[in-house]
Interface confidence: medium
């Protein structure tokens, strides 16, 4: 048991308690409140919420848990509204008093429906679809012969890559998938369908065999 010198008894402290999980998942366009309670003695002097190295100058409040003179417990709330897919990341609460500093971080992930960034016929005859979303989208391929609207015959991709998996996982994740178009010998439509837990988006390549194969494409949500 370590001994405590007389001066250490009076030393200040700050203890922070998150009131919600420090890993937060929120859907695109929804609101979330990041809430902490903290004990501070002596009384807190500076509080701030930070995101991307910038301090919030509004959208948060800080107040004592009770009005008693002896109160040492406080609450701080950051109100995030209509979050966009680009606004995920680490949100940090910092508090200090005359003796100590303390901080707590929340990792906020914004779930977004896949968006198809590009869908192209490459010079090597491959069809390529690139989609972004969070969680990571899955890309499936389907072929519908003739003028059928429902594409049910699945086509196995030749190549699938997650393009930015090395970066921090707060933003949208980008997936690239390719199939070989030389397998298609009939008029019809190829569907590239990107989906995750939030929703799905499709893009279509139309094949019309005449003198040359020139698929043109259009996009549906």
């Amino acid at each position: 048991q370590p001994s405590v010198s007389p001066g250490e008894v009076d030393k200040g402290f700050i203890n922070i308690f998150p009131m919600i999980n420090t890993t937060v998942f929120v859907n695109d366009g929804e609101n979330v409140d990041l809430i902490v309670e903290y004990e501070a003695f002596p009384k807190p002097e500076h509080q701030q919420w930070i995101y991307m190295n910038r301090t919030f100058t509004d959208k948060w409040e800080d107040y004592p848990k009770s009005e008693n003179e002896s109160n040492i417990r406080y609450v701080s709330e950051l109100h995030l509204t209509r979050l966009k897919g680009t606004e995920g990341g680490t949100y940090t609460f910092l508090v200090s008093n005359s003796d100590v500093n303390a901080a707590i971080a929340f990792n906020v992930y914004v779930n977004t429906k896949p968006e198809i960034l590009t869908y192209d016929r490459l010079v090597n005859g491959m069809l390529q679809c690139v989609a972004a979303g969070f969680p990571e989208p899955t890309i499936d391929w389907y072929f519908c012969p003739g003028t059928e609207q429902r594409c049910s015959a699945s086509v196995l991709p030749v190549d699938v890559q997650t393009l930015n998996s090395s970066g921090p996982p707060f933003g949208k994740l980008v997936v690239q998938s390719s199939i070989d178009s030389s397998a298609f010998k009939h008029n019809g439509t190829v569907e590239c369908k990107a989906y995750n837990d939030v929703g799905k988006t499709s893009a279509y390549f139309n094949f019309a065999f005449k003198e040359q194969i020139h698929p043109h494409h259009h996009h549906h949500h």
């Epitope: 910038r54 100058t57 509004d58 948060w60 606004e87």
Partner: antibody, heavy 127, light 108 residues
Amino acid sequence: EVQLLESGGGLVQPGGSLRLSCAASGFTFSNYKMQWVRQAPGKGLEWVSYISSSGGYTSYADSVKGRFTISRDNSKNTLYLQMNSLRAEDTAVYYCARVAHQYYDFWSGYYGAFDIWGQGTMVTVSS
Amino acid sequence: DIQMTQSPVTLSLSPGDRATLSCRASQSVSFNLAWYQHKPGQAPRLLMFDASTRAIGTPDRFSGSGSGTEFTLTISSLQSEDSAVYYCQQYNYPASYTFGQGTKLEIS
């Protein structure tokens, strides 16, 4: 009618303290950032202090930092400026002003120019 | 901190004249610039925001222009009630605001 009304000004000795109030009416006070601005005799307007809509964030001009404290009571629709260690150069008419909802910034919320001003209250620091 | 510099310090003109007031920022404030009119014994009044947008109640003889660091307030045909001190103010940095030192407009 949207209105701001300052009170609490007066004559105070150097080193003394004063608390200004600004009563808001005609709008949802808790939705708006507020400011204090002053004008010393024969001088121009000088921004003094800012407070966020919830009261969580404050900022100050260098000339008053560490001596003045801005606060608000949204339940009473009132803005305050606690002025301590007053100096002769703090002699001025003090105005409270509302920040318009003209822009939206992710870190700052709504902000803009000062669209509503009070009539001002005179603070004189003299021995 | 951003400094705002106004010129001229004083402008003496006659009714019907055109007044041009200038404001320069020490660094870019985009379009986040306001103009205020201040008469003795009254509260300052917001005239223009967004550099060129008239506030409610501002007569259309007032117009604003500029962006970045150079701004102008123009009063096309002066009236006697336009006698006042005019201030520009940047609000590009929402928790810290800066006023110019003012231009006194005298109409004789």
